[in-house]
Interface confidence: low
């Protein structure tokens, strides 16, 4: 049903008239106001954002605003201490030091508090030994080195480029080789794209530019020091041995630059394939250690960076619904940026801004949405998604009863070919039927409509005329609210044509030279990609909240769980012999997924026909469909992820920004003919497929009739 | 105006020894920490030594410590730089710099580097 039928809602005050106020000179003006200084959590300019960003949200309309609080795990280098990297000789003499930050981009020269490029959360030492040179490291790379080249990481520095997985992933993998230290760098082959010249001339990554990040392995948690629970005034810490997901060795990125210079010396073994190979011209030798001539020289990291317990702070906004104001539909994005975040966040936390504004506009008015939105500015995503997930800590309660939806609202842009899309399935219907009614920005689309636009340049790989969504995976906002609470979840935003380079980012990601000048010059001039994400993230809120019968298409659920216990079972069947031997069958599962299937499209047929002027019957099925997705919530987490809950989706054990399907039957399956006792891990696969099973037969049920 | 002028740099062989010295202006000099980096033609900025507003906390780059000596004198606005037992690698120019501490002391920030530097050549 379209949202004019929502109680209170005048013709005047329709989806058209939400979006017909977002302006594309707005989201350029916020993001202008947001990108001048840096906003690091824990920092007072964060809170001053915040502080700005409460007052205007209170202007714009909304019927409350309030700073959530927290005191959390954060990072921060040495500020008398710096960090860097040497090349020590026979004596112990440094004959080259990497840089100890990034030039400044013109007219930031004189800013104060730019952080140095470093690795949150690393630990303070000065390991010194020869280097690996390891790839990407991940899983793969190092089961080449070890099983295939026979090279033995313990004790050694590595370093790694950049991309491809999790930078978080690549520590864990170092620290399980056995190594000492991680220097972590952006290669041009990942981090320059060809034909486009480095910052400020465009759009590419200069070789003095470093990009930041966090290293922890929180699998979730949020505050390392109160996994669990709220970071409040109250709340009992652990003790820093006991914190959960921090790195046990030290780690430091550099720039392509500084690579060289440690890469052009490199001996030992060649590289084992093209695949190791990037664009610098060294020979990408593995090691360990450098050359001949270089044999005596070793490599020296300095890290001295603390964790400290600091405040932050999250901006949330309330605009109360007119019919169901105790059903939450949550728009949340980040706003603590490494240095300038003219990305990341801030291209996103414009659009939140604007969004807010639009919304705020139809309420002065008179209007209201039929169920409660929530908007929210969160700190310290860059520091492990902290703010979100403590606040949902808090308000779990709340949540799980309550929450509808949470539509993310981190960087808009990654690119400006086309639309990128990670939904429950659950959305899916709601964001095709949404782009099918806004207009395409793309350039030879002109007055065509965005869905097709999109479809056409990323098309899904099993259904023609369809465009491609994404699982979602993670390192994001909507994480705790996803994978741990079970709320339908989606994230939409402008990307690149790259899809080899999907967890890479763009090039100047976390660095200095993410600016406002860099979105203003030479990603979107006209804010019209900026426009469309606002259209397209504010159009699911509007949808989500006003939509007399909840816009979620359970079928659609149906359809991947075939799909995704399909692909689980092949890879279980490249074990045939031991899947005999040990009686390993997937029938519960597949006979899970055809009742699922059988009782969604009775339910979806029940769906059509009910009587929706009955409220009683109207928000029993809205709550069937709500708690759809909390029904794949297994309250006993993941093995060794607690706080990955969700047994349809998790994070990739491999890779944190990917998603996995069936994530504990994968990760009992994975490498396991390498297993010292075949019988236990097959075990453990027979006892996965049991809870996936079961969870999918549980979840369908509560599609059913109610009685 | 944040005015800092470098001096005292030149030629010497290995082994040598030269005091570098910066006058600054423009600001008040025993508010900030300064600092000493360095770069070498063609390469990335070298953090060198820095030394807290009273002169009681000193840091050095592992590669000078025990060769060079950094001190201050706020009465006369000035910045020092003693430097002895030079190597080759010591080569390049020299800037001093104004440690910019804005709001959040927890890290190293940007600094304000208004000379021009000066040279110091080490060669046999």
């Known amino acids: 049903k379209s949202s004019n039928e929502a109680t209170n809602i005048t013709p005047k005050h329709n989806m058209k008239a939400f979006l017909d106020e977002l302006k594309a000179e707005n989201i350029k003006k916020f993001l202008y106001n947001f990108t001048q200084i840096p906003h690091l959590a824990g920092t007072e300019q964060n809170f001053q954002l915040a502080k700005q960003i409460q007052s205007q949200w209170k202007e714009f309309g909304l019927d409350s605003v309030e700073l959530a609080h927290y005191d959390v795990l954060l990072s921060y280098p040495n500020k008398t201490h710096p960090n860097y990297i040497s090349i020590i000789n026979e004596d112990g003499n440094e004959i080259f030091n990497t840089s100890l930050f990034e030039p400044p981009p013109p007219g930031y020269e004189n800013v104060s508090d730019i952080v140095p490029p470093f690795s949150a959360f690393s630990p303070q030492g000065m390991p010194e030994g020869d280097l690996v040179y390891v790839n990407y490291a991940r899983t793969e790379d190092f089961f080449k080195l070890e099983r295939d080249m026979k090279i033995n990481c313990s004790g050694k520095i590595v370093i790694a480029r950049y991309g491809k997985v999790f930078r978080g992933n690549k520590v864990k993998n170092a620290q399980l080789a056995g190594a000492k230290g991680v220097i972590l760098y952006s290669d041009p082959a990942d981090y320059f794209a060809p034909g486009v010249k480095s910052y400020p001339d465009g759009w590419n990554l200069p070789g003095g530019g470093v990009q930041r990040g966090n290293i922890l392995n929180l699998n979730g948690a949020g505050d390392p020091l109160t996994p669990g629970y709220p970071a409040n005034e109250y709340a009992y810490r652990r003790g820093i041995a006991e914190a959960v997901g921090l790195p046990s060795i030290p780690v430091h990125p550099i720039g392509y630059y500084d690579a060289q210079k440690l890469l052009e010396k490199m001996g030992g073994s060649a590289p084992p394939d093209s695949s190791w190979r990037g664009s610098l011209k060294v020979p990408y030798n593995v090691g360990p250690g450098f050359t001949g001539n270089f044999s005596t020289q070793k490599v020296k990291m300095h890290i001295h960076s603390t964790n400290e317990v600091t405040r932050i702070y999250n901006v949330i906004g309330t605009l109360r619904g007119a019919v169901e104001p105790d059903r939450y539909v949550i728009l949340g994005g980040h706003r603590d940026s490494w240095v300038f975040g003219g990305i990341d966040p801030q291209s996103g936390a414009a659009v939140v801004h604007e969004i807010v504004r639009s919304f705020g506009t139809l309420k002065k008015e008179g209007w209201r949405p039929r169920r409660t939105i929530l908007f929210a500015s969160w700190d310290a995503e860059e520091f492990g998604l902290l703010g979100s997930t403590e606040w949902a800590e808090e308000n779990s309660r709340l949540l799980q009863e309550r929450g509808v939806a949470y539509i993310n609202a981190d960087s808009s842009i990654e690119g400006n070919y086309t639309l990128r899309v990670d939904c429950t399935p659950l959305m899916y219907s709601l964001v095709h039927n949404l782009t099918k009614e806004l207009k395409s920005p793309d350039e030879g689309f002109e007055g065509k409509s965005l869905y097709e636009s999109w479809t056409k340049k990323s098309p899904s790989p099993e259904f023609s005329g369809m465009p491609r969504i994404s699982k979602l995976g993670s390192g994001n906002d909507f994480e705790v609210f996803f994978q741990r609470l079970g709320i339908a979840s989606g994230r939409a935003r402008y990307t690149k044509n790259w899809e080899t380079n999907k967890f890479s980012g763009y090039p100047l990601y976390h660095s200095v030279y993410e600016t406002y000048e860099l979105v203003e010059k030479f990603y979107d001039p006209m804010f019209k990609y900026h426009l469309t994400v606002a259209q397209v993230r504010g159009g699911m809120v509007f949808e989500l909240a006003n939509s007399i019968v909840l816009p979620f298409d359970c079928r659609d659920y149906a359809v991947v769980l075939r799909k995704y216990a399909d692909k689980i079972y092949s890879i279980s069947m490249k074990h045939p012999q031991e899947m005999k031997t040990y009686s390993v069958s997937f029938d519960s599962l597949f006979s899970a997924v055809k009742n699922f299937t059988e009782i969604a499209s009775k339910f979806s047929e029940r769906l059509q026909d009910f009587d929706k002027s009955n409220p009683i019957v109207l928000r029993m099925m809205n709550d069937q469909l709500m708690f759809l997705e909390r029904a794949f919530i297994d309250p006993l987490g993941l093995p060794d992820r607690p706080f990955y809950r969700h047994v349809i989706y998790a994070p990739s054990s491999h890779n944190k920004y990917a998603g996995e399907s069936f994530p504990g039957i994968y990760d009992a399956l994975f490498d396991i003919e390498s297993k010292v006792d075949p019988s236990k891990a097959w075990g453990e696969v027979k006892r996965q497929i049991y809870v996936a099973a079961f969870t999918v037969q549980a979840a369908a049920e509560t599609l059913s009739e109610v009685a | 105006e944040v005015q800092l002028v470098e001096s005292g740099g030149g030629s010497v062989q290995p082994g040598g020894s030269l005091r570098l010295s910066c006058a600054a202006s423009?600001?008040?000099?025993?508010?900030?920490?300064m600092t000493w980096v360095r770069q070498v033609p063609g390469k990335g900025l070298e953090w060198v030594a820095n030394?807290?507003?009273?002169?009681?906390?000193?840091y050095y780059v592992d590669s000078v410590k025990g060769r060079f000596t950094i001190s201050r004198d706020n009465a006369k606005n000035s910045l020092y730089l003693q430097m002895n037992s030079l190597r080759a690698e010591d080569t390049a120019v020299y800037y001093c710099?104004?440690?910019?501490?804005?709001?959040?002391?927890?890290?190293?920030?940007?600094?304000?580097?208004g000379g021009q530097g000066t040279t110091v050549t080490v060669s046999s």
């Open positions: 710099a104004r440690d910019r501490g804005g709001a959040v002391a927890l890290y190293h920030n940007g600094m304000d580097m």
């Open positions: 423009g600001f008040t000099f025993s508010d900030y920490w």
């Open positions: 030394i807290k507003q009273d002169g009681s906390e000193k």
